[in-house]
């Protein structure tokens, strides 16, 4: 297992319906044609993995149909974008990139997006 | 280093509106958020709100809603602090601060509005 | 919106004592989110302590945090000279974020 440098923002504020969107980029050493994406959400010390997608470089990511998270391709970077976001899922998310194929197998872990999640506020009640 | 220079001191009269600047070097300007906070004289610290200069979203406490509006110029790696219909309570000095993970830091050095008739 | 109180208001102490400053928040906090600062007169406030229990870079080791839930705690082992100012808890836990009122720690 060979180490790879892999750069996300530090910051990023959600929108106000929820979604969060960062870029994941990779300083790839060779050319890697199957890449395994994994977005891992650290908070309160505890790591839990929120989602992860297998490409083949010029495809689309491709996530479970259930999934949170969408994203695109261009070159080493990964766009990423995490939706359905709420208040209580602030936290850390940190993007692992895995170069599958062909060897040697690469493992790059950033230093994570901090993403803050603003519930709306609601709106006051209004007569018709 | 890691540096935050604002804009200088500024006198207004009550419904104008003022403009403050925060220029960031020393690191990546799109990469973290900018918060502004505000001190009355001899007052407390209070939050006023903050960017996300990655995606330019803003969150702003509720009390200043609709009078401020925080923005940046990533090409000059510059955030901007504009309070609209100023009232003499809004006499203040005005600091910006690089938002990270859980932290505000490093501070601006600070700007003094001052809001008189 | 999550109240942080701070007490006491004021620190009466000398040189070389043990400061203990207390944060206590309406809410629930996730220690993830909670910070302290340090402000002296003139000057810009000045980050000390994040995550509740974490060190910012130059700080020194007189100065630790603790706590959790809705009680926090910044203590100064030793009190040096140059750490008679005011101290600021603050929370990111949820918005809006929100400052105590201050410490002052002053020389008896």
């Known amino acids: 297992c060979k180490a790879m440098h892999v750069a996300q923002p530090a910051v990023v504020l959600a929108s106000s319906r929820g979604i969060a969107s960062f870029v994941c980029e990779y300083a790839s050493p060779g050319k890697a044609t199957e890449v395994r994406v994994t977005v891992l959400r650290q908070a309160d010390s505890q790591v839990t993995e929120v989602c992860a997608a297998t490409y083949m470089m010029g495809n689309e990511l491709t996530f479970l149909d259930d999934s949170i998270c969408t994203g695109t391709s261009s070159g080493n970077q990964v766009n990423l974008t995490i939706q359905g976001l709420r208040a209580m899922d602030t936290g850390l998310y940190i993007c692992k990139v895995e170069l599958m194929y062909p060897p040697p197998y690469y493992l790059g872990i950033g230093n994570g997006t901090q993403i803050y999640v603003i519930d709306p506020e609601p709106c006051p009640d209004s007569d018709f | 280093q890691v540096q935050l220079v604002q804009s200088g001191a500024e006198v207004k009269k009550p419904g104008a509106s003022v403009k403050v600047s925060c220029k960031a070097s020393g690191y990546t300007f799109t990469s973290y958020g900018i918060s502004w906070v505000r001190q009355a004289p001899g007052q407390g610290l209070e939050w006023m709100g903050w960017?996300?200069?990655?995606?330019?979203?803003?969150n702003y406490a509720q009390k200043l809603q609709g009078r401020v509006t925080m923005t940046t110029d990533t090409s000059t790696s510059t955030a901007y602090m504009e309070l609209r219909s100023l009232r003499s309570d809004d006499t203040a000095v005005y600091y910006c601060?690089?938002?990270?993970?859980?932290?505000?830091?490093?501070w601006g050095q600070g700007t003094l509005v001052t809001v008189s008739s | 919106e999550i109240v942080l109180t701070q007490s006491p208001g004021t620190l009466s102490l000398s040189p070389g004592e043990r400061a203990t400053l207390s944060c206590r928040a309406s809410q629930s906090v996730s220690s993830s989110y909670l910070a302290w600062y340090q402000q002296k007169p003139g000057q810009a406030p000045r980050l000390l302590i994040y995550?509740?229990?974490s060190r910012a870079t130059g700080i020194p080791d007189r100065f630790s945090g603790s706590g959790s839930g809705t009680d926090f705690t910044l203590t100064i082992s030793r009190l040096e000279p140059e750490d008679f100012a005011v101290y600021y808890c603050?929370?990111?836990?949820?918005?809006?974020?929100?400052f105590g009122q201050g410490t002052k720690v002053e020389i008896k």
């Open positions: 960017i996300s200069v990655y995606n330019g979203n803003t």
């Open positions: 603050q929370q990111y836990s949820r918005s809006p974020w929100t």
């Open positions: 995550g509740a229990s």
């Open positions: 601060a690089r938002v990270g993970a859980n932290w505000f830091d490093p």
